[in-house]
């Protein structure tokens, strides 16, 4: 058992048919000695009486709030939670797998540039008594401060019958160094909370490998005369890092016709505009890279080629 | 060139040549073995690489200030990898996949440290950590860690080279 | 299993440009440098540059720069090596052949004849 | 560039002859080299690469050996379907550059 924070404790427990359970020891937190007694969540049934209750957890049933009193005056809580492991493996049933980049992602983050931002986001089907908290730091032996905020819904789609839930959260490294190459990762640990059950799930990552680009702003088209070319030109998205002759960006180009299976036409450039044939009914898509480092591409940017 | 002491670096063609190792640094790390990557281990890369650190100088403002610094640290960083891939960890069992730009790397990482320090001049040089794994399968692990770490080092790199030949550059 | 297939022969007039095109299958097109060797009647083999199709990232002979330009269509898994301004020595097979290191895979050969 | 000299540029052997050949380079390449075998009309075959390493599907006949500058090819016992010609290559930082080529002719 541990304190998750004040009056809450985590059960740890493994979970097999007739397992035997933990035996747990809760303490009343007053300085009264006699006539103390304890109950469990709103039954008013008394469990024991005296300062400690020793109970044996082995399922949902025997978590809760157990709360002791003396004469009817409330004197301390204590919150249990479970946290099962089945089979040496800790239970992951709050959130759902996400499978990108591969299997057992249960968190997905992003950075827009090299700030020390970043934002990392999960999905659940649970829609009620459901909380999180997030840490994060960088390194872990001996850890840099990074700052979380709180998990919010960020997002709710409809997946069949089900109703999905996304929850996000930003976090910033206290101490960000841009220019540096990162040698320990950030660790992201979210503590998730569903009734009575208790879930961890963490992420360790180099902010160079989350590292996805807005999508290049102000595209444009100028016809070229006498051509069946135009020339596309764009501009670095704003919350990409600077200086840009640092930080540079890559580029690729697509001239995409209506149908799916028409031939595409892609070019690569490190400029911020090319020169290509705009066929009828196209349209001309850009996307961005880190130039000098393999992380995600961009989103597109598109203009049609009318 | 950077010589000790402070003249400037061929800025565009070490600019050119940090773009190269970028793409071979990437072009090298599916090949340099048959392993699934999931079996790479999700622990911290070797500990023994020189990284590009904070207080290096190869920030923008770091750079505009004296970039001697800078030089002489992404200098040592070449010659440590250049080491690596001539030493066993790379040349011996498993071999590399017949198809590996492993060789057009290696070159490469010399030849830019030599444009950084041309012959006759001498900054120091980090020591070489004497790395050698006795199993095939732990060398090959070391292979896409040095890599991974590698890709990091030649990024900053490339970015300092970009930023030196677009702005002080004379 | 791998396989390269270039497109067929093709006759040229000095002066002119020919693009010969090299289809790849039976593997992830864009992880691998593609590399265009030729080889000119009863002569040897002559590099003549590589490209990264993730990034299109090239590198020429400099015997061929500026008469060369290799492309990759990544939709398509295809390399292609456009050679201008042909002259008669330009006659030779062409090849491409995966990787950026040893050649363990080699399309067929591509004759391209330069005559007047 | 780096250049590579071949020797010898032809040679006559027998059925079941121990043949080598040699490469030299002109700089040192570490152990960034191969070997290729052509036959007229066909494309070359990979034989040998990082100088010792048997390719997929290669003989055990073959072999090679060498690091820095000297490098080379031997055919331990020279079978019927290996008369052809025989190119090394350097991978180490481009141009690549090939050998001129060593002919193997029935004696």
């Known amino acids: 058992i541990w304190e998750l924070k004040k009056d809450v404790y985590v059960v740890e427990l493994d979970w097999y048919p007739d397992a035997p359970g933990e035996m747990v020891v809760l303490t009343c937190d007053t300085p009264e000695e006699d006539g103390i007694t304890w109950t469990l969540d709103q039954s008013s049934e008394v469990l024991g009486s005296g300062k400690t209750l020793t109970i044996q957890v082995k399922e949902f049933g025997d978590a809760g709030q157990y709360t002791c009193h003396k004469g009817g005056e409330v004197l301390s809580h204590s919150l249990l939670l479970l946290h099962k492991k089945e089979d040496g493996i800790w239970s992951t049933d709050i959130l759902k797998d996400q499978k990108e980049p591969k299997n057992k992602t249960f968190l997905r983050c992003e950075a827009k540039n090299y700030s020390g931002r970043f934002t990392c986001w999960w999905l659940t089907t649970i829609s009620t008594d459901l909380t999180f908290s997030v840490k994060s730091s960088r390194g872990s032996s001996d850890p840099q401060g990074v700052t979380c905020g709180a998990a919010t819904l960020s997002a709710e789609r409809v997946r069949g019958d089900n109703k999905e839930y996304e929850y996000s959260v930003e976090c910033q490294e206290d101490s960000a160094c841009p220019a540096a190459e990162e040698s320990l990762p950030i660790e992201v640990m979210v503590d998730a909370v569903h009734k009575l059950k208790y879930e961890n799930y963490t992420s360790s990552f180099f902010i160079r490998d989350i590292i996805k680009p807005d999508p290049p702003k102000n595209l444009q088209l100028k016809p070229l005369k006498n051509s069946r070319q135009v020339e596309v030109s764009w501009e670095y998205p704003d919350t990409w890092s600077t200086p840009h002759s640092y930080f540079s960006l890559t580029f690729c180009v697509q001239v995409q016709g209506k149908s799916k299976r028409e031939k595409k036409d892609r070019v690569f450039t490190d400029k911020t505009s090319a020169t290509v044939i705009c066929r009828k009914n196209a349209s001309i898509s850009v996307r961005a890279q880190d130039r000098y480092y393999s992380s995600s591409w961009s989103e597109w940017a598109s203009v049609p080629c009318s | 060139r950077a010589v000790p002491g402070g003249s400037s670096p061929a800025w565009t063609q070490c600019q050119q040549l940090s773009q190269k190792l970028c793409t071979l640094a990437w072009s090298a790390h599916p090949l340099v073995g048959h392993m699934d990557l999931r079996e790479e281990g999700d622990e911290e890369t070797t500990n023994d690489v020189p990284h590009i650190q904070c207080g290096d100088g190869c920030d923008p403002q770091g750079l505009r200030d004296n970039s001697q610094f800078c030089l002489q640290r992404i200098h040592q960083g070449l010659i440590f990898y250049e080491k690596l891939l001539g030493s066993d960890i790379f040349t011996g069992e498993p071999s590399l996949l017949p198809d590996s730009p492993v060789g057009q790397l290696h070159a490469s990482l010399l030849g830019l440290s030599q444009l950084l320090q041309p012959e006759g001049h001498h900054w120091e040089t980090q020591q070489i950590p004497s790395l050698s794994p006795s199993q095939p399968w732990q060398r090959l692990l070391l292979r896409f860690k040095i890599l991974r770490s590698l890709q990091a080092f030649v990024a900053v790199a490339a970015r300092v080279f970009a930023h030196g030949a677009a702005t002080l550059s004379p | 299993q791998v396989q390269l297939v270039q497109s067929g022969a093709e006759v040229k007039k000095p002066g002119a440009s020919v693009k010969v095109s090299c289809k790849a299958s039976g593997y992830i097109f864009i992880t691998y440098w593609m590399t265009w060797v030729r080889q000119a009647p009863g002569q040897g083999l002559e590099w003549m540059g590589q490209?990264?199709?993730?990034?299109?990232?090239?590198d020429y002979n400099e015997k061929f720069e500026g008469r060369v330009t290799m492309t990759t269509d990544t939709s398509t898994s295809t390399a292609y090596m456009e050679l201008r301004s042909l002259r008669s020595d330009d006659t030779a097979v062409y090849y491409c052949a995966r990787g950026g290191g040893g050649f363990a895979y080699w399309g067929q050969g591509t004759l391209v004849t330069v005559s007047s | 560039d780096i250049q590579m000299t071949q020797s010898p540029s032809s040679l006559s052997a027998s059925v079941g002859d121990r043949v080598t050949i040699t490469c030299r380079t002109s700089e040192n390449i570490y152990s960034y080299l191969a070997w290729y075998q052509q036959k007229p009309g066909k494309a070359p075959k990979l034989l040998i690469y990082?100088?010792?390493t048997l390719a997929e599907g290669v003989p055990s006949r073959f072999s090679g050996s060498g690091s820095g500058t000297d490098f080379t090819l031997t055919i331990s016992s020279l079978q019927p379907e290996d008369f052809a010609t025989y190119y090394c290559?350097?991978?180490?930082?481009?141009?690549?550059?090939f050998g001129q080529g060593t002919k193997v002719e029935i004696k």
């Open positions: 490209i990264f199709p993730a990034s299109g990232s090239a």
């Open positions: 290559q350097h991978h180490y930082g481009i141009p690549f550059t």
């Open positions: 990082n100088a010792k």
